[in-house]
């Protein structure tokens, strides 16, 4: 009821706390001499449910029967209306609609660690919409009982603050929770348990790992546990993996040997504990230990490729390239690569350690038979060397793959296809597809990429180091014993018309014709593989269509003759470049007048 109602009263029957669905009677009555002046018959009492008028009556009192109230609190306010004045509040009352508590379900108790305290949880059931008090009771041997009350509105957890000890681990304890509110009470089913049932060990701590003789095959995990722990489970995984390896151990006494760890791998280890084979629950997982396993000598062999370049009549340049071993093959940090170059007939050998690079270039005589061996070394040893005989990779014309094509395949991929060589295709032992960015200067510093393909394959998808709008020189090699044949093609993953045309840098006259020279378009403006150049010319100040000459693109070409110009006529000349996607804008314009005699 609203405190200190001077003008009248509001009463609620049977109670201001009711069960959902019940009916209540609300009475509003004026106190003596609190009605309208002059005529009490003019008293108009109005009953509001919050701000909505639900009933009115002329006189000293009003009765109203109310049904269908919702869960929660509803406020009723009684007001008096007199002629020629505002309504004034008389009094008010709240009605609280709720339900009796449901039986608490799934009561379960736990003691965290041997030194912890007993705490229980349960499911409350549906909200009562009323203040509901929960009392937890625990009874044990020798008529011992403990009780704890919960003052929290949504109570589903209580800690007794007592510790069960392992003196009699089979002794029974019984817990029960009772919910009480203004509309009733309900108790859970009793939950009976022993010390072993409810004690959940603390997670193991102080986890360490030791590798005997710095070897991954002799690894022991150590940890500390509470005294009564009987079982442990270990889980471990490489730090970059989502899948755990799981091991269960009994009576481990804080140590376990692990036999299947990979070398030079960061692992995450966690341990959990339990007091009894089939009673109680597992502890939480321990905090993670992260540790890197020791290195082992590399396995596998390097993938090695090479390029030969003619220098002069007596010397050639050999560039060797190799790919990093995979992490599982390297089995440690690769400290250096060992390259051995040997002349097979004379037996001369030269060895060099390479650090920080995966390539090596040297100059050797053009005579003799040369071989190289490359291996990778970490702190524990070296991989088996990859041996390669240096040969002329494109010498055997009959081994050259046929009908090589290169087509864009989605984003930043190129599909290279070919036909086997004319010479007995079964002689091919493997194909190598090699690609590098096309640089007009034939720059040998441009990184080289390659992949190996089985002899029965006639296509390869290249995607490593492929950029959009860049032209690649692609070669397909067919290798057979100490012979090789090759074919090449230009290809790009994505193209558009070049951003600019070639820049004409000189026009010279030679015997009645002219020679046009130009600068290559910068690589970043070519926007793919160039197919043609076009040279346009027309008479100065003429409105006629220009004539043109189309030249197939060749990497090193940067001049071309034209012999159809008339003497003593001034011409304007310009150039464009074309990819498969279209033609560039004009390059610069140059004027030229041929001085030669007219026919």
């Amino acid at each position: 009821k609203i405190d200190a109602c001077k003008r009248g009263d509001v009463t609620v029957k049977p109670s201001h706390v009711i069960l959902l669905g019940s009916t209540v009677n609300i009475t509003c009555s004026l106190k003596p001499r609190q009605g309208c002046f002059h005529y009490s018959r003019r008293n108009k009492l109005i009953l509001y449910k919050f701000d909505r008028r639900i009933n009115f009556h002329h006189g000293h009192s009003l009765n109203s029967q109310v049904t269908g109230l919702p869960l929660g609190t509803t406020l009723f306010v009684c007001k008096l209306a007199c002629i020629n004045s505002d309504e004034i509040q008389i009094c008010g009352a709240e009605i609280f609609v709720g339900v009796a508590p449901e039986q608490p379900q799934n009561l379960s108790c736990i003691q965290k660690g041997e030194q912890g305290t007993v705490a229980c949880t349960w499911e409350r059931g549906r909200d009562t919409h009323l203040y509901t008090e929960y009392t937890l009771q625990l009874s044990g041997p020798k008529n011992l009982t403990w009780q704890k009350q919960c003052k929290d509105i949504y109570c589903d957890y209580l800690d007794f603050g007592i510790n069960l000890t392992p003196e009699s681990p089979e002794s029974n304890f019984t817990a029960k929770v009772t919910a009480v509110n203004s509309l009733g009470s309900s108790s859970s089913l009793p939950s009976t348990f022993t010390f072993l049932d409810i004690v959940r060990p603390l997670p193991p701590w102080d986890i360490r790992i030791k590798f005997q003789k710095a070897s991954v095959s002799r690894c022991t995990l150590y940890w500390r546990d509470e005294g009564l722990v009987l079982l442990n489970r270990l889980r471990y995984r490489p730090s970059n993996s989502r899948l755990w390896n799981m091991v269960n151990v009994t009576k481990a006494k804080g140590r376990h040997d692990l036999l299947d760890l990979k070398p030079f791998t960061e692992y995450e280890f966690q341990i959990s504990s339990k007091l009894h084979l089939y009673k109680g629950s597992w502890s939480d997982w321990s905090e993670s230990l992260r540790a890197q396993t020791p290195e082992e000598e590399p396995t596998g062999m390097l993938d090695v490729w090479y390029m030969k370049r003619h220098i002069d009549y007596s010397r050639q340049q050999i560039s060797l390239f190799w790919k990093n071993l995979s992490v599982s093959e390297a089995r440690g940090k690769i400290l250096h690569y060992q390259v051995t170059l040997q002349e097979l007939t004379g037996g001369k050998a030269m060895t060099q350690n390479i650090t920080g690079h995966t390539s090596w270039t040297t100059v050797i005589p053009r005579t003799g038979n040369w071989a190289v061996a490359v291996s990778a070394a970490n702190s524990k040893g070296s991989s088996l060397p990859t041996r390669i005989n240096i040969m002329n990779l494109c010498e055997a014309g009959l081994l050259a793959p046929r009908q090589v094509s290169a087509n864009s395949e989605g984003m930043d991929n190129i599909l290279v296809t070919w036909q086997p060589p004319r010479k007995d295709p079964s002689a091919v032992q493997e194909y190598v597809v090699e690609w590098r960015e096309l640089h007009p200067g034939g720059d040998t510093q441009v990184p080289l990429n390659w992949l190996r393909s089985r002899p029965y394959n006639v296509s390869a998808l290249i995607s490593e180091n492929i950029k959009s709008y860049i032209c690649y020189e692609i070669r397909v090699y067919a290798l057979s014993g100490d012979q090789g044949g090759c074919s090449s093609i230009l290809g790009n993953s994505k193209h558009k018309a070049p951003l600019s045309g070639p820049h004409i840098n000189a026009i010279t006259e030679e015997k009645g014709s002219i020679l046009i020279s130009w600068n290559s378009i910068p690589v970043q403006e070519q926007m793919g593989c160039l197919l043609h150049y076009r040279i346009y010319w027309k008479e100065r100040d003429s409105n006629s269509q220009p004539q043109l000459c189309e030249i197939p693109y060749r990497v090193s070409q940067n001049s071309h003759p034209i012999n159809s110009l008339q003497p003593r006529v001034t011409y304007v000349l310009w150039m464009t470049a074309l990819t498969a996607a279209g033609e560039s804008s004009h390059g610069n314009e140059r004027e030229f007048c041929l001085q030669g005699k007219a026919n």
Epitope: G72, T73, L75, L130, Y131, I153
Partner: nanobody
Framework: QVQLQESGGGLVQPGGSLRLSCTAS????????MDWYRQAPGNQREWVAS???????YYDASVKGRFTISRDSAKMTVYLQMNSLKPEDTAVYYC?????????WGQGTQVTVSS
């Protein structure tokens, strides 16, 4: 034990605005309505506005359209935003938390509307 603490009252000119706050301690805030009442000198306390536990607002006719009640369950606070204030709104404003075990009242905050 629940305690309620109002704040935000003061002197304001007619037509002005004030925002009252009422902060509760104790966990029962979330299942009950919260109410604002006011008491002018010589009068009894009268109901101004209520907000249910689910956030539905209700207002007395004298303040409807000018006052707005709201609640922030995380902060256990109820607010009364009072706009277009009139001299007849002058009173001590109380917040109340009604429960079936009894009502909890704040100590009140004075609002004076005067030019």
């Amino acid at each position: 034990q629940v305690q309620l603490q109002e704040s935000g009252g003061g002197l304001v000119q007619p037509g002005g605005s004030l925002r009252l706050s009422c902060t509760a301690s104790g966990s029962i805030f979330s299942i009950y309505n919260m109410d604002w009442y006011r008491q002018a000198p010589g009068n009894q306390r009268e109901w101004v506005a209520s907000i249910t536990s689910s956030g539905d607002p209700y207002y007395d006719a004298s303040v409807k359209g000018r006052f707005t009640i709201s609640r922030d369950s995380a902060k256990m606070t109820v607010y009364l935003q009072m706009n277009s204030l009139k001299p007849e709104d002058t009173a001590v404003y109380y917040c109340k938390l009604p429960t079936e075990k009894g009502n909890y009242w704040g100590q009140g905050t004075q609002v004076t509307v005067s030019s």
